[in-house]
Amino acid sequence: LRPSRVYKPEGNTKRALTLKDILNGTFSYKTYFPNWISEQEYLHQSEDDNIVFYNIETRESYIILSNSTMKSVNATDYGLSPDRQFVYLESDYSKLWRYSYTATYYIYDLQNGEFVRGYELPRPIQYLCWSPVGSKLAYVYQNNIYLKQRPGDPPFQITYTGRENRIFNGIPDWVYEEEMLATKYALWWSPDGKFLAYVEFNDSDIPIIAYSYYGDGQYPRTINIPYPKAGAKNPVVRVFIVDTTYPHHVGPMEVPVPEMIASSDYYFSWLTWVSSERVCLQWLKRVQNVSVLSICDFREDWHAWECPKNQEHVEESRTGWAGGFFVSTPAFSQDATSYYKIFSDKDGYKHIHYIKDTVENAIQITSGKWEAIYIFRVTQDSLFYSSNEFEGYPGRRNIYRISIGNSPPSKKCVTCHLRKERCQYYTASFSYKAKYYALVCYGPGLPISTLHDGRTDQEIQVLEENKELENSLRNIQLPKVEIKKLKDGGLTFWYKMILPPQFDRSKKYPLLIQVYGGPCSQSVKSVFAVNWITYLASKEGIVIALVDGRGTAFQGDKFLHAVYRKLGVYEVEDQLTAVRKFIEMGFIDEERIAIWGWSYGGYVSSLALASGTGLFKCGIAVAPVSSWEYYASIYSERFMGLPTKDDNLEHYKNSTVMARAEYFRNVDYLLIHGTADDNVHFQNSAQIAKALVNAQVDFQAMWYSDQNHGISSGRSQNHLYTHMTHFLKQCFSLSD
């Protein structure tokens, strides 16, 4: 038996992090995102739950809704109508999938100081929103869309086809919510509130995933979800637009699908209103390397939406899939014709392009061996975007302004030199025409949110600087975090290493690799975090490393598309390469190396453990994918094609975890899954376990009854991290 090794941070009055600190969220940070309601005004919910209205220019603040009114209906969220007369109060939040939830809504009349009593809203509502002007309400109830001209008016039913698990109007089905739209809604108001566009998803022919939910009853409940796995029948999607001024005169009008898309299976990917009578729809072929952006106009004479062929813009990838994780959305100019969009340039880096007539004639706005990530706002004279250009670190995000009024356009980094050490990873929130904006810095230092003048970029005010967190961390021994790159052959891999306090290069430390590794993901980011791995480094003296291998994002398509049609190969290979390089650094105890990951990371960690290299002593897979045939069509097929003989069935089969069951014999494997995982079904772990049993390979397992993909209920999460900690400490011979 190996003697137990106890890591003791040396003589220091500061204490190490404890697992309890992590589980209690003791060191969580705050961000501040203004809820913009005009060019210079925003709302924010105060610590004591008052809804406070701020005017930047007068520096005045008003409590427009008191916490007592919020409390009277147990409201946890709110939404102000654009005419400022009403506010909806949301309560009885009940989570469904990643973004979706149902809730009860109450309408409060701010001008009368009372709740609207007539024609109260049904419950529970699946989605509710105000029109962009006035106080019309659109909501989805039992998969149908309803409209109210005013909160106290009777509702008008717009759709009648809605049916549970069959037809969804104005809300996405499971696969569209998770893999395409990343929203709980599928309806969009036109800017003037005249039209309402919505999507109808028909899931009638989709196979059902069924799993038990044990609850407390004598019999478990069965959860049924239409869930298309790779190669299965997909939702049939149609887009409609209804005139909300006279919804009863003319019914919803269907928007035509571009011919080149409609000729085979396809997806709707997003909708963007350009002006009050112009809309832009994006479509994608089922084989996701061709995307079409279609601009459609309302024809008053026909009472129809026309999408001329010369307003169709095709985006195609020859090396992989279209877009990044999702196909980017356009940011239209004031002329309502031209737009800015991020897509790959000739060198395979994603950059901003300006499209005036055709994609072929697009003018490239940014360029370089880095990537433009998101366009925040286009105004008359400026375009604001984020990128990872600064100092060549892919895991940073800075905000840039391009003065499009100038010729040639001039570029300025708004954030690069603001708080250079503390802040290297930003996002932003802009008022309507970017007169003001908030910057939210996520690290690597303590997060800070600030308010800025959109003309001069001058900082006006600190909104949140996490002073309390700063004070509570003063007596904590935090690990040291390094972000560096390593080279292997012609490849460069960025890694983040979390080193124990008083790290000494001349000593040997156990190593834990944390991996995600999914296509278009990024783990090596310059962000602040105090989490489980921070604790493992701080208290248990474990070196943690995260490595972005091939397939990860924001380093060009050559690196990204390397994994196309062959998932499970290079992601694993690159983790192994990195481990070998870390061993060469001299401070890693090669007898004590582990790997762990969740979801896609569980897949990669499983394959790495089963790589037969002998590099890993042990590892953990939480909610892993075990075969791409078990996962959602939109995701699996984007990166793997179809599981058919004439397409890519062979690699679907040989990239499973089950195919490598024999190779787990010489590692300690902990397999964990929630039984109510709607996303990566428990089936995945059940099949791994079956294969390991069939191969007579010993392993450890833990299931979490009625837990979903996040295993996030307080008790389960505590149990999970405590269990994984024991497993790791045992593996590394660290005493409790």
């Epitope: 209205f53 008003y62 005419d83 400022r84 001008q111």
Partner: antibody, heavy 119, light 107 residues
Framework: QVQLQESGPGLVKPSETLSLTCTVS????????INWIRQPPGKGLEWIGL???????NYNPSLKSRVTISKDTSKNQFSLKLSSVTAADTAVYYC?????????????WGQGTLVTVSS | DIQMTQSPSSLSASVGDRVTITCKAS??????VAWYQQKPGKAPKLLIY???YRYTGVPSRFSGSGSGTDFTFTISSLQPEDIATYYC?????????FGGGTKVEIK
């Protein structure tokens, strides 16, 4: 319900200071600003100034040197002082609520009090 | 100061008529224009704010439109109780300024 009530002397001598009080009820002072507006007999409306929720003030430049608006939150009272008055200051004076929910328009008015400047 | 020029200064119309009053700002005030109704001996009442939003309890025959410098106030069907003076006001910047008023009478 929302109420704003102006009070003060109906007659002020030229060169003296006009002092009015506005007592409000039925709404929270954290939600609204208070404006003072005046209307000379048979004429249009003139904005005098306002006091923000935070206590800051804004005055009409044409009256700025003579006007002071203040508040006593504990009593739900606002006051207007206009110094060195002349006959041209004869008007009905209104205390008016305004705020962000109506884009700083004026949504509730007191019934007004007539102040005559005369010796 | 922003000048608000209101026209006409008075008008006479029959019951049921459509009545339109215009207001022109001396500079861009976005949509920050309000309309008030004042009956003789009474305080003004807010009808429309932010150019087009009807204040709570205001009948739907009153409407407003416009943005920038040109604004319109409409009574779609004049009623006897609408006899009053109507004022526009910009609430865009200080000092808040009013139009000169339009006196509406019944023919």
């Amino acid at each position: 319900q929302v109420q704003l009530q102006e009070s003060g002397p109906g007659l002020v001598k030229p060169s003296e200071t006009l002092s009015l009080t506005c007592t409000v009820s039925g709404f929270s002072l954290t939600n609204y600003d208070i404006n003072w507006i005046r209307q000379p007999p048979g004429k249009g409306l003139e904005w005098i100034g306002l006091i923000w929720t935070g206590g800051g003030t804004n005055y009409n430049p044409s009256l700025k040197s003579r006007v002071t608006i203040s508040k006593d939150t504990s009593k739900n009272q606002f006051s207007l002082k206009l110094s060195s008055v002349t006959a041209a200051d004869t008007a009905v004076y209104y205390c008016v609520r305004g705020g962000p929910l109506v884009w700083y328009a004026l949504d509730y008015w007191g019934q007004g009090t007539l102040v005559t400047v005369s010796s | 100061d922003i000048q608000m020029t209101q026209s006409p200064s008075s008008l006479s119309a029959s019951v049921g008529d459509r009545v339109t009053i215009t207001c022109k700002a001396s500079q861009d005030v976005s949509t920050a224009v309000a309309w008030y109704q004042q009956k003789p001996g009474k305080a003004p009442k807010l009808l429309i704010y932010s150019a087009s939003y009807r204040y709570t309890g205001v009948p739907s025959r009153f409407s407003g439109s416009g943005s920038g410098t040109d604004f319109t106030f409409t009574i779609s069907s004049l009623q006897p109780e609408d006899i009053a003076t109507y004022y526009c006001q910009q609430h865009y910047s200080n000092p808040r300024t009013f139009g000169g008023g339009t006196k509406v009478e019944i023919k």
